[in-house]
Interface confidence: low
């Protein structure tokens, strides 16, 4: 069937438009294109005659038309008037006629459009605005964006007028942004530069800045104020309600007591007519005293007296806070605090308590620190330690001792020989000494300020012969694989040589064995059960030696796991059950049974007569040493046989 | 009467030592708390070290710990600061001071008597 498709359908004004025939029949004489629905001699724009190749125009041909030999019809410049339809009047050889309408419309190209409103200055929560999208043209849709995006959905936003007015109702500051409309229609679609809505409002209640209220005399005061406004707010301020100045920021240098009252901002907005305030209240305090501490004692004993330090001056409605070490008070039963905290005692003063403490007083604003203080604690003096600790000298030489006391105020010294005073010196010299110089001698330790005396008597031995040494121990029960044993030979004495000997050897060479203290201690690292020996030490000098009793080291070990005997593991119906468990330890281990889990006797032997196939089953023996704190354990299966 | 008379002072570049001392006459030496201030030009006198008459405690600012050691010498009526680790920032006046029994300050109060200082220069 003959059909006529317009390429395009809307075509915009200007353009041309393609008429394409689609199933034009053949054996054709020609064809003749009309402007209308219909065949209408009036209205022929062209006709062709296919034999001549000739185009005849018509009564509506107006020059911009163009006939293919495929009977197909270009209308260039396409003006208004050309939109409708458009029917072909094709003949065929047999004279038979056929005929097909096409149609197109023709649109305008659309301008730029622009954005009117009813006003351009509305205020807040008060006006309406009305943009209206120009130029009003027939055929058009009008379509409304707000910062690049579509209408939101909101009640206060209105389209009307065919979409070609946007009204906003009682405008709000958030509606500042940015329009723009846009005109379509079939052929072209064109966007309005952006109107930026300008949406008066405020002042909004000022904020003053900072928020604090509180100020110390003789610091600065600026506050500063800002109230939400379009167009800029202006700024008054009121203090004790007398006009100030006016201005965003009130500065006041080096306020006093006198400064303290009612502050207040007032924000106008000279295009909205409207005023709001915001009112502050200022304080200004004193300035503090700075803190001190006194105390009841400056000369506290330890152990006996107490100390009440009070922190000054004594300020009603204050907070008294106290630090010790640059630290919090410590919970202690030592520590009391007054009601007011004001006064803090300390009960039984230790040399420990000196400190240093610091006070102090907390007020709104911040918290003023006393200076630090330290207690002058008298102690001791705690027992003398007399050095060297030699016991033993050899005729000839010179005895230096010294003595030293923990002490404050530092101890005053005296020696004594045999209860006999000597000197009042911290060290004591004895040249060339000899046998006669053998005796007790005392260093006694004065402290004057707390009365306190102590002594320590020490046995000078003088003797060309050294004396029969003896071994002592740090641990005279040691765990195998756990611990340590240091054997020492005394005494301790001047220039000597001190030996070591394990069962009569010399001592084998082993990392687990290492001498120290001049060779006078011997230390057994993670001793073994065959450590176990007897040791000697000897000691000997230029012109004499001398060894010790032996001293066999008593080593704790095992439980190891236990041996079950005899080895036996089936027995006949009838026999008696005999079984012996034995584990290595020192000391020996408690024996306890077990049979199929249930416990029977504390005995290392288990005895049971004419045994029967309801002896089948497990038999534990469990062993403990309670001095390691080790267990061990075996089971041994036994079968009885009909 | 009594005395503090400090010595040892001088110009050190940075990193180096020096030992003050401050003899002290006229006083029962082993009873008094003894301490180093400094004062450097257009600041406040500030305390240093300090240490207690037995020697068993000492006390630094915070500034000197680490780097300055504070130590006596009661047979000799002597207090010592060793400083080492100098910095252009210990550069100052120092004084020695004396504080009888009683609580310790930790600042210039509580001292009863002072030295006429030494100068301490730390420069390149």
């Known amino acids: 069937k003959l059909t006529i498709e317009s390429t395009p359908f809307n075509v915009a004004e200007g353009k041309e438009v393609l008429l394409l025939v689609h199933n034009l029949p053949q054996h054709l004489f020609g064809y003749s294109w009309y402007k209308g629905e219909r065949v209408d001699g009036n209205r022929q724009i062209i006709g062709y005659v296919i034999g001549t190749q000739q185009a005849t125009p018509g009564p509506a041909y107006s020059g911009r038309e163009i006939i293919y030999p495929n009977a197909s019809l270009l209308i260039q410049n396409i003006i208004q008037n050309d939109t409708g339809f458009y029917t072909l009047h094709v003949i065929k050889s047999d004279l038979v006629n056929e005929e097909a309408t096409g149609q197109f419309r023709v649109y305008p190209e659309l301008p730029k459009p622009s954005i009117s409103s009813n006003n351009s200055k509305p205020v807040e929560d008060k006006d309406a605005v009305a943009f209206t999208c120009e130029p009003e043209t027939q055929d058009a849709t009008y379509l409304w964006w707000v910062n690049n995006q579509s209408l939101p959905v909101s009640p206060r936003l209105q389209l009307s007028n065919g979409n070609r007015t946007l009204t906003l109702f009682n405008v709000t500051r958030n509606d500042t942004a940015s329009y723009k409309c846009e005109t379509q229609n079939p052929v072209s679609a064109r966007r309005s530069d952006s109107v930026i809505l300008n949406v008066l409002y405020g002042p909004d209640a000022p904020t003053i800045s900072p928020l604090n209220t509180s100020y110390r005399s003789g610091e600065n005061l600026n506050l500063s104020c800002h109230a939400a406004s379009n167009p800029p707010a202006q700024y008054s301020w009121f203090v004790n309600g007398t006009f100030q100045q006016s201005t965003q920021e009130l500065f006041i240098p080096n306020i006093t007591v006198n400064n303290s009252g009612s502050y207040t901002c007032q924000a106008h907005n000279s295009d909205t007519g409207l005023n709001r305030t915001t009112v502050t209240t200022i304080t200004v305090y004193a300035e503090p005293p700075k803190p001190f501490i006194t105390s009841n004692n400056s000369n506290p004993v330890e152990d006996e007296d107490a100390v009440a330090l009070t922190c000054e001056p004594e300020i009603q409605n204050t907070t008294y806070l106290w630090w010790v070490n640059n630290q919090s008070l410590p919970v202690s039963p030592r520590l009391q605090l007054s009601n007011d905290n004001r006064t803090l005692t300390l009960l039984s003063v230790t040399r420990n308590d000196v400190g240093p403490y610091e006070c102090g007083i907390q007020n709104e604003l911040s918290v003023d620190h006393s200076d630090p203080v330290i207690l002058n604690v008298l102690y001791g003096p705690d027992d003398p330690t007399i050095s060297p600790s030699y016991t033993y000298y050899r005729p000839g030489v010179n005895l230096s001792l010294s003595c030293h006391a923990a002490s404050n105020p530092p101890a005053q010294y005296s020696w004594l020989i045999d209860g006999n005073i000597q000197q009042h010196t911290q060290e004591l010299f004895i040249s060339n000494i000899t046998e006669k110089n053998s005796g007790l001698y005392t260093c006694q330790a004065n402290n004057s300020a707390s009365g306190h005396s102590r002594t320590t008597v020490k046995t000078i031995t003088v003797s060309a012969e050294l004396p029969k040494p003896s071994i002592s121990s740090n641990n005279s029960k040691p765990v195998e694989d756990k611990d340590a044993v240091a054997f020492t030979c005394e005494p301790e004495a001047q220039n000597t040589t001190y030996l070591w000997w394990v069962n009569g050897q010399s001592l084998p060479v082993s990392p687990r064995l290492q001498l120290s203290n001049g060779n006078r201690t011997l230390t057994l690292f993670n001793v073994t059960r065959n450590d176990a020996r007897a040791y000697v030490c000897g000691i000997q000098n230029s012109v004499s030696a001398n060894r010790s009793d032996p001293v066999t080291l008593d080593v704790l070990y095992g439980p190891d796991t236990p041996i079950i005997s005899p080895p036996d593991s089936s027995y006949l119906s009838g026999a008696n059950l005999n079984l012996s468990c034995h584990s290595a330890s020192n000391p020996s281990p408690q024996y306890s049974w077990r049979i199929n889990g249930i416990p029977q006797q504390h005995t290392q032997v288990l005895f049971i007569a004419k045994i029967t196939p309801n002896n089948n089953g497990t038999y534990a023996c469990f062993v403990s040493n309670l001095a390691t704190g080790r267990n061990n354990s075996i089971v041994k299966s036994i079968t009885v046989s009909a | 009467e009594v005395q503090l008379v400090e010595s040892g002072g001088g110009v050190v570049q940075p990193g180096g030592s020096l030992r003050l001392s401050c003899a002290a006459s006229?006083?029962?030496?082993?009873?008094?708390?003894m301490g180093w201030f400094r004062q450097a030009p257009g600041r406040e006198r500030e305390f240093v070290a300090a240490?207690?008459?037995?020697?068993?405690?000492?006390y630094y600012a915070d500034s000197v710990r680490g780097r300055f050691t504070i130590s006596r010498d009661n047979a000799r009526n002597t207090v010592y600061l060793q400083m080492n680790s100098l910095r252009p920032e210990d550069t100052a006046l120092y004084y020695c001071a004396a504080q009888h029994f009683g609580p310790i300050g930790l600042t210039t109060r509580g001292y009863h008597y002072w030295g006429q200082g030494t100068l301490v220069t730390v420069s390149s």
């Open positions: 006229g006083l029962t030496f082993s009873t008094y708390t």
């Open positions: 240490i207690i008459w037995s020697g068993s405690n000492t």
